[in-house]
């Protein structure tokens, strides 16, 4: 997260880290005791999932292996539409005050809505500085019409933009797949943005979760 702040401890109990060995790969969001939602571009053969801690590499955190993941069948590596994936944990999570599932959206929030995005991604770009603490950034949803002025036809119908005018605050390497939460519901998953990260008036681009609720529920049901 560029130009963010340290999240209030324990305020994001649904935030997970997808690790390759001990190295951060992507963020993710707990949606059920067996399931993590993340970005399709975060796919790997297997994952080490850290839950229940704001510190990356925390020895006291829950760590669960995941060997199965289900990409949205319409994900395109060319256009990056449908950048969403479910990761099935090999064993269920132990729920607690530190580990909770996020609330999936009942509706799509409108432009102007205040949201928070979080992650352990680099805080500087293009040179990287990875924080140990979970970082947050407060951003507002931007209309597709406004966002298309920047990204033109790169912006797909189920992509959501968020940012703050004239501000550098944004997501970056390592934040991918992490949550954009608005009014206590998951509205976005970190997908992409311009590079170097943090260029003012280049919004962060997210997968718009409200458009995928049926796919999420059906996929979890099919593979439970």
């Amino acid at each position: 997260i560029i130009d963010g702040y340290k999240c209030k401890e324990g305020s994001h109990p649904w935030q997970v880290a997808l690790l390759k060995g001990n190295q951060l790969h992507c963020g993710g969001v707990l949606v059920d005791k067996y399931w993590v939602l993340t970005a399709a571009h975060c796919k790997m053969g297997q994952y080490q999932v850290q839950l229940g801690s704001d510190k990356i590499g925390d020895q006291s955190a829950q760590k669960i292996k995941a060997t199965k993941s289900f990409r949205h069948p319409g994900y395109s590596t060319k256009t990056h539409v449908n950048d969403i994936m479910l990761v099935r944990l090999d064993e269920p999570v132990k729920m607690s005050s530190k580990v909770e599932a996020v609330q999936l959206p009942e509706h799509c929030e409108p432009p102007g809505t205040s949201c928070t995005v979080s992650g352990w991604g680099t805080t500087t770009s293009p040179d990287v500085t990875f924080p140990s603490d979970l970082m947050c950034s407060d951003v507002k949803l931007i209309s597709s019409r406004e966002c298309k002025k920047v990204y033109k036809d790169l912006l797909g119908k189920t992509m959501l933009c968020a940012g703050i005018p004239d501000s550098k605050t944004n997501t970056c390497n390592g934040d991918s797949g992490g949550p954009l939460v608005c009014n206590d519901t998951l509205q976005g998953l970190v997908s992409w943005g311009t590079y170097p990260c943090g260029q003012p008036n280049d919004p962060g681009v997210y997968t718009q979760v409200c458009k995928y609720k049926r796919w999420v529920m059906e996929t979890m049901k099919t593979h439970r």
Epitope: H41, H80, L154, T171, C172
Partner: antibody, heavy 122, light 108 residues
Framework: QVQLVQSGAEVKKPGASVKVSCKAS????????ISWVRQAPGQGLEWMGW????????NYAQKLQGRVTMTTDTSTSTAYMELRSLRSDDTAVYYC???????????????WGQGTMVTVSS | DIQMTQSPSSLSASVGDRVTITCRAS??????LNWYQQKPGKAPKLLIY???SLQSGVPSRFSGSGSGTDFTLTISSLQPEDFATYYC??????????FGGGTKVEIK
């Protein structure tokens, strides 16, 4: 230091295959993609394809589809490009290049290997 | 696919000259254009990304401008080490990536 080091020059017969390696050092391999670009003698740059270091997702230039395979080995931070059914017009210098960006997209090539000359001749 | 057309294909100039190279995209690519320099027998090197941002370590005599379909690379005062071939790439971040045909800058 931050660099991409490629394997040495190859001479191949028409119809054969070649596999070129590209070892990354000095940076974390995972978050980046690797693209392969070739340059025939006296010609311009031709993009061949791209691979995500972690996911193994690929995009190939249409004209090479079916003949080219790009892979990565994250344990050794190495990318590979294999080109099959070689023809004389595949004679070129082959470059690997780091694709800089984050998340699902990359925007430019900010680090290049030194190049590998592949000669196809009977 | 987006086509990139560079002009001129070659030019002769003297040390100290101001040199301008243009690159035209077949459709709008916003400001997502990059410039590379390649010296004989060497790999290309990134000079400018996002149409106008100077890559770290590149001398300030290099500058880029433009958006949409028309872009310019300017060398304000040509130095001996600048004699090379220059390529633009209008990736627009979506494959396939296309490079311009190149502009060779030679000594007059």
């Amino acid at each position: 230091q931050v660099q991409l080091v490629q394997s040495g020059a190859e001479v191949k017969k028409p119809g054969a295959s070649v596999k070129v390696s590209c070892k990354a050092s000095g940076y974390t391999f995972g978050p980046y993609g690797i693209s392969w670009v070739r340059q025939a003698p006296g010609q311009g740059l031709e993009w061949m394809g791209w691979i995500s270091a972690y996911s193994g997702d690929t995009n190939y230039a249409q004209k090479l589809q079916g003949r080219v395979t790009m892979t990565t080995d994250t344990s050794t931070s190495t990318a590979y490009m294999e080109l099959r059914s070689l023809r004389s017009d595949d004679t070129a210098v082959y470059y690997c290049a780091r694709a800089a960006g984050y998340g699902a997209r990359w925007w430019y090539f900010d680090l290049w290997g030194q190049g590998t000359m592949v000669t196809v001749s009977s | 696919d987006i086509q990139m057309t560079q002009s001129p294909s070659s030019l002769s100039a003297s040390v100290g000259d101001r040199v301008t190279i243009t690159c035209r995209a077949s459709q709008s690519i916003s400001s997502y254009l990059n410039w590379y320099q390649q010296k004989p027998g060497k790999a290309p090197k990134l000079l400018i990304y996002g149409a106008s941002s100077l890559q770290s370590g590149v001398p300030s005599r290099f500058s880029g401008s433009g958006s949409g379909t028309d872009f310019t690379l300017t060398i304000s005062s040509l130095q001996p080490e600048d004699f090379a071939t220059y390529y633009c790439d209008g990736s627009y971040s979506t494959p396939p990536i296309t490079f311009g045909g190149g502009t060779k800058v030679e000594i007059k």
